[in-house]
Each structure stands twice: as C-alpha cells, then as structure tokens.
C-alpha cells in the first residue's frame, strides 16, 4: 500500500506535485530542466533568517515590507513499496527583486549531487516567481529511505523546507543470518537470525532440513538453541512481515569427526640414519588437525616387529625420521589427530636408508713385528654388523713412523676379505703407530685407537705384540 501522512494529499495544479495548498501559484507554467541555481538580483542584502524563514529587509518602491520567505508545506511522509516510482516536490514564491538564489536537495544531511532526477520549474509573475523543485526516483530501493529537504540560498541566507520522509517498505531484509558451524556430536549450540523491515514487525521461523522447527514465530532478532545433533543438518530462517517472507541462506551444521588418513605420503630423501617424509593430510573431520604420528617398523620379516612412534606438529606436513639403521628397510605409516581423535593409519609404505660409513672402528687391533721378514703384522676384528652401516669393502690402515726428528705417515687400503695385513718396516730404531678404519661404499669409518710398536735396530729381537683391547676386555 502507498500512503502519505500526516498531511493529506491534495491534487496540485502542476503535474507530479504533492502539495497541501489549494491555491494555484501561477496560471502559466514555464518549465526548465534541472537548475539547482536560480538567479535573482536583490537590490539590497537580506539578513539572517530564523528556522526556515527568511525575513528580507528589502522594501519595494512603495516601501511595503516583504513577506517572510518560506517553502510551502508539502506531503510529510510517503510510504511505498520497493521498486515503485515516487515523485515529490518543494515549492516557494520568491519576489522578483531577488537574484542569485540556489535550490538544492539534501538527504539525511548530505547534499544530493549528480545523477538524481531533480527538475526545477519557474512560474514568473509581475512581483513574484513561483519555483517548484521536483525530485523523482523511478525504482525505489531501501537505500532511498530517509529524510529529504530542499535548501534555497538568497543573499547568503539559507531557507530550509520541511522534511519529506520517504519510507520504502519491502520484504524483510536480513541483517544477521545463521552461520555454518562445526559442532561436537550431541552438544548444544546457538544460531542467530535477524531481519528488519519496514514494515515492522518482522517474525522469524526456523527451518531444519526443510522442516519448521518452531510452530509459533519469534520476533526478530531470534536465537535458536539446538540441543545437539547426531548428523549433519541444514538450517535456515524465514523472516515474515506484512509484505511477505524472505528465506535466509541455508547453512550446513557439520558434526566433528575423527579425520581421514593422509591421502599421500612422499619419501623426500634418505640418508644412512634418517628418512625425510612429507604427507598430504586427508579430510580434517571438520576440526583442525592438532598433531601427527609417524609409525616406523623394520620391514625385515625376521625383526621383532616393534613399532617406533614419532609425534610431530600437524604442520608443515614434513618430518625427518632419525636414529634409523643404515641400509635397512622400513615400513612407515602416518596418522593425524584432531580434537575428536586419531585418524586411521595411512597404508604402510616402504622406505630404505642408504649405506653409511661405519660408525665404529675395527676391534682388538694387534700389531707385532715379524723380524725375519722385516714386516709388521696387523690383526683386528671387524666392527659389529649393526655398526658397519653398510657392506664392508675393505679397511684403511694408517701407519706413522717416528724416529729422532723424522715422522712419516703412510696409508694402505686392504680388501674386505680377512682381518689381517702385513706392512713393510719403513724405519728401524723407530716407533710405528698403527690405526685402522673400516670402509663401506658410504665412506670411511672412524680410526681405531693408536697401537704403538717399537722397531729396534737390526739384530735386536723383541717379539712382544702391541694391541688395543676389545671393548669389555680392558
């Protein structure tokens, strides 16, 4: 419905005018396009006005005082539906002695400039010119709601019209709609819905999975308390007013669950004692991942099957598994958790560490002089298999010869077969210091503790061997 209040609408003499005055202003209309500024030349400046009335000091030739200038009363309140057209106006009679006047439209305290449909019409007479400023909106929107006034400037004085209140009514408009949520199973939560008119009041119905929740409507705003859900649901709210109903967006309320296992695992890099892995997390179960667990077990069927567990933060989906044996095969699984619990472990994947340099030196190194052949015999025990960190390809022997003022170091490489070597005596009456390191394709391991033997001058016999004890034999 459209209504105007508090003033009745009288048919005016000019097309589109909404005015309360029956008396025609002029009989001969003279229309112009939109001209916010109108020029009249006063013979003498006016003085400040009170309210929307200007009381000019100028008097005519007959010295009659001029009436105060004011906009005529017009319609005070226009109610109409969205998308309808509306036209309203201000009218004023201005003595012809005034020039340099300006009429402008203002809405809610801000001047309306630019592309507005404002037209000013002039109706000149002998003594006064009637001015009608019309404002039209072809298809009103809610944003057109507000208080409109005309302002007219005469001699730096401002005359202000009574406000015209435009009230655009339509379907309810949501100012707050329910939001999607992830909730714990069987736990209460709230949804909020707020809508406004005009027209008011706005009543709210809640809808769950296409069925109404409340039989009686609630006045907007409305808060729905859901006692708990066991499965995903879609909620929306209906806002009703005299113009009809508007339905909010449907929001999905998800039930938090344990996450899905990772969808990918990548072996990024392997060393002798570590494997760098990354993974792509699976579906998070509507709850952020907290941390992840990397499970590692030896893939060797003869191993005891014990599982090593490495816990890490959920980000950055990357972890370096350390303290692994060299040249070993491992099965790796990844699982991640959220607030609800742990995902299943990903399918087990296979990864291997590379060959490394041995981590310990050969054991029980024994050195003795074989004087008859002028050689030094060296014997040792290979490092324990687990600490070889690969396949032994041989040994490196360092022997340093020291006598008065002379020192020279020699290196020998020997094959992996056996655990003995023979080196030629380099210097007599000198000390020979021997150290041995095991070698794999992964590199050279640490050297054993030095073992010293004195090489006497020719003819002096000493067969006593020198040795390093095996661990635990000291």
């Amino acid at each position: 419905r459209e209504e105007a209040k508090p003033y009745p609408l009288f048919p005016g003499p000019f097309p589109g005018s909404l005015q309360t005055d029956h008396t025609p202003l002029l009989s001969l209309p003279h229309a112009s396009g939109y001209q916010p500024a109108l020029m009249f030349s006063p013979t003498q400046p006016g003085r400040p006005h009170t309210g929307n009335v200007a009381i000019p000091q100028v008097t005519s030739v007959e010295s009659k005082p001029l009436p105060p200038l004011a906009f005529k009363h017009t319609v005070g309140h226009i109610i109409l539906s969205e998308h309808k057209g509306v036209k309203f106006n201000c009218s004023i009679s201005v003595p012809n002695i005034y020039q340099d006047t300006t009429i402008s439209w203002w809405k809610d305290g801000k001047e309306l400039l630019g592309a507005h449909h404002a037209i000013t019409q002039f109706y000149p007479d002998d003594e006064v010119t009637a001015i009608i400023a019309s404002f039209s909106i072809t298809s009103v929107q809610r944003s057109d709601n507000g208080s409109y006034i005309c302002k007219m400037k005469i001699n730096n004085e401002e005359i202000v019209s009574d406000p015209i209140y435009i009230e655009v009514q339509g379907l309810p408009h949501f100012t707050k709609q329910p939001e999607s949520m992830n909730v714990t199973r069987n736990t209460a939560f709230n949804l909020t819905c707020q809508a406004v008119g005009p027209p008011e009041p706005v009543n709210i119905f809640w809808v769950q999975n296409s069925s109404r929740v409340n039989e009686q409507p609630e006045k907007s705003p409305s808060v729905l308390t859901v006692p708990g859900l066991t499965e995903m649901a879609v909620f929306s709210c209906e806002a009703h007013n005299d113009k009809g109903l508007t339905v909010s967006k449907g929001v999905q309320i998800n039930i938090k669950a344990i996450p899905s296992p990772p969808t990918e695992v990548s072996i990024r890099n392997s060393t002798a004692h570590s494997i760098l892995i990354s993974w792509v997390p699976g579906f998070d179960g509507y709850s952020p991942f907290r941390n992840c667990s990397i499970q590692v077990k030896e893939a060797d069927p003869l191993s005891n099957g014990s599982v090593m567990i490495f816990n890490t933060s959920a980000l950055p989906h990357l972890y370096q598994i350390k303290q692994l044996q060299a040249l070993a095969n491992y099965s790796i699984g990844v699982s991640c958790m959220n607030e609800i619990g742990w995902s299943a472990v990903s399918p087990w994947i296979l990864a291997s560490t590379t060959e490394g340099a041995p981590s310990v030196a050969p054991l029980n190194v024994t050195v003795f002089l074989n004087e008859s052949s002028d050689n030094v015999d060296i014997r040792w025990m290979k490092p324990p298999t687990k600490q070889q960190d690969g396949e032994l390809v041989g040994y490196r022997i360092s022997h340093v010869w020291q006598s008065a003022g002379i020192s020279k170091e020699l290196l020998e490489e020997v094959g992996q077969n056996g655990s003995r070597a023979r080196i030629s005596v380099q210097v007599h009456n000198a000390t020979c210091t021997v150290r041995i390191a095991a070698v794999t394709r992964g590199g050279v391991g640490p050297f054993s503790d030095p073992v010293k033997i004195f090489i006497p001058a020719h003819g002096w016999v000493d067969y006593a061997p020198s040795s390093t004890p095996a661990p635990g034999n000291a």
């Epitope: 990918e264 990548s266 072996i267 990024r268 890099n269």
Partner: antibody, heavy 128, light 111 residues
Framework: EQQLVESGGGLIQPGGSLRLSCAVS????????MSWVRQAPGKGLEWISI???????YSASWAKGRFTISKDSSKNTMYLQMNSLRAEDTAVYFC??????????????????????WGQGTLVTVSS | DAQLTQSPSTLSASVGDRVTITCQSS????????LSWYQQKPGKPPKLLIY???DLASGVPSRFSGSGSGTEFTLTISSLQPDDFATYYC???????????FGGGTKVEIK
Amino acid sequence: EQQLVESGGGLIQPGGSLRLSCAVSGFSLSSNAMSWVRQAPGKGLEWISIISSSGSTYSASWAKGRFTISKDSSKNTMYLQMNSLRAEDTAVYFCARVGFFVGYGAYDYGIIHRLDLWGQGTLVTVSS
Amino acid sequence: DAQLTQSPSTLSASVGDRVTITCQSSKSIYNNNWLSWYQQKPGKPPKLLIYDASDLASGVPSRFSGSGSGTEFTLTISSLQPDDFATYYCAGGYSGDSDYAFGGGTKVEIK
C-alpha cells in the same frame, strides 16, 4: 556429494589432438592425486597417467610423449591432452581419484594404492 | 613390465554359489599387499571393492572378501547375488615403477 565428470570426448581423425577434462566436486584436487584410465570397446582397463596433489606426474611408458596429464586446482579440474591419436586409442576414458599414493621423489616414481572414486567416462573415437 | 593374470576369464555361476577368482602377479606387489579388486557393470565405471588385498571398501557387502600376499591373490563371493553378475578386475602397483597394472578381468555370468 563427491563427483567426477569427464568431458571433451568425441570423434577425431587419426593424427588429431583432443583435450579431455575431468571436473571435480565435493573434494579438492590440492588434497588428492588423480588418475586417467581407459577402456577400449569390449576390452579391459588400462592405466594411463597420474598427477599428485602437488602436481608431480607419472605416466605409463606407452603414454609418454603423446599423452599429458595436468590440472588447474583453482578450477578443480584435471585434464588429459592427447596428441597424434591413432585408431587404437579409441576407448572410454575415465578419470579416477587416487585413494592413496606414495611418491618417491628422489627416484622419480610413485605408486597408486587404490582408485576409490570414478567418473562415468567419456568416449573418444579415432576414425577417418 | 609386471603383469597381472586373472583366472578364469569367464565364470558361469548361479545365485547362491560361492565364487572364487584368482589374480597372479609376475612379481611381488608393492608391500606385498597393495592389490585392489574392482567391479564393473556394462556401461558403468568400475567400483572399488577391496584394497590392501583384504580390506573391504566402504559400502561393500560382507559377502565379498579378499586374501593373498606377494604374488597370489583371491577374490571370493561367499553367496552370489543377482547384483553381483559383472566383470571383476584386480589391480596393483610395484616398487620402482609408476605403472598401475590391471588384470585382464573375469566376467561372472549367469549359468
């Protein structure tokens, strides 16, 4: 609802090129590896190619050079570019989600664990 | 390239029968168990039935079961239902190779 929809199939002359698309809904290509599989009329299934969530690609040896897998994660769509088509490429082409995938970046290969969601397929006919 | 060989290629059976399909690999499947079984009906895409040789995919009836490790695998339907007449494929991956191999298929038809 999780869904895969293939498109782009049709009749093509030998030597021609075609690009198939696989539109994904209900999950993200940035979280799942995807694969193409084909099936010639009356024949069995034949794996073509895989693209991991990060964009690494691996193909069957017979497909390398002629078939290229790619994706646009912003459009949640995967593609198969097929060049130098032959009569024996006539088949229904399926896209499928890889349920789990292990990648061996240092050795440039990866292994599919399972294909857990399939599209309806699009028919490509290569004929003069 | 590794190959998966299914047998039989065709199998005639009646509703209620116990049906067994075998899948043999020319070399060990990755991790000895990364073998899957798929069911396909005419004009439809394949559907995952079993993965990890013996784990049932979501929504698959318990009358389907899988077993095996390494190179020998079996799919069993304990009591054939009218909806089970279809073609079944095994598939798996191998270490050191990106290829995902499919078996030749076994068509289960009504006797």
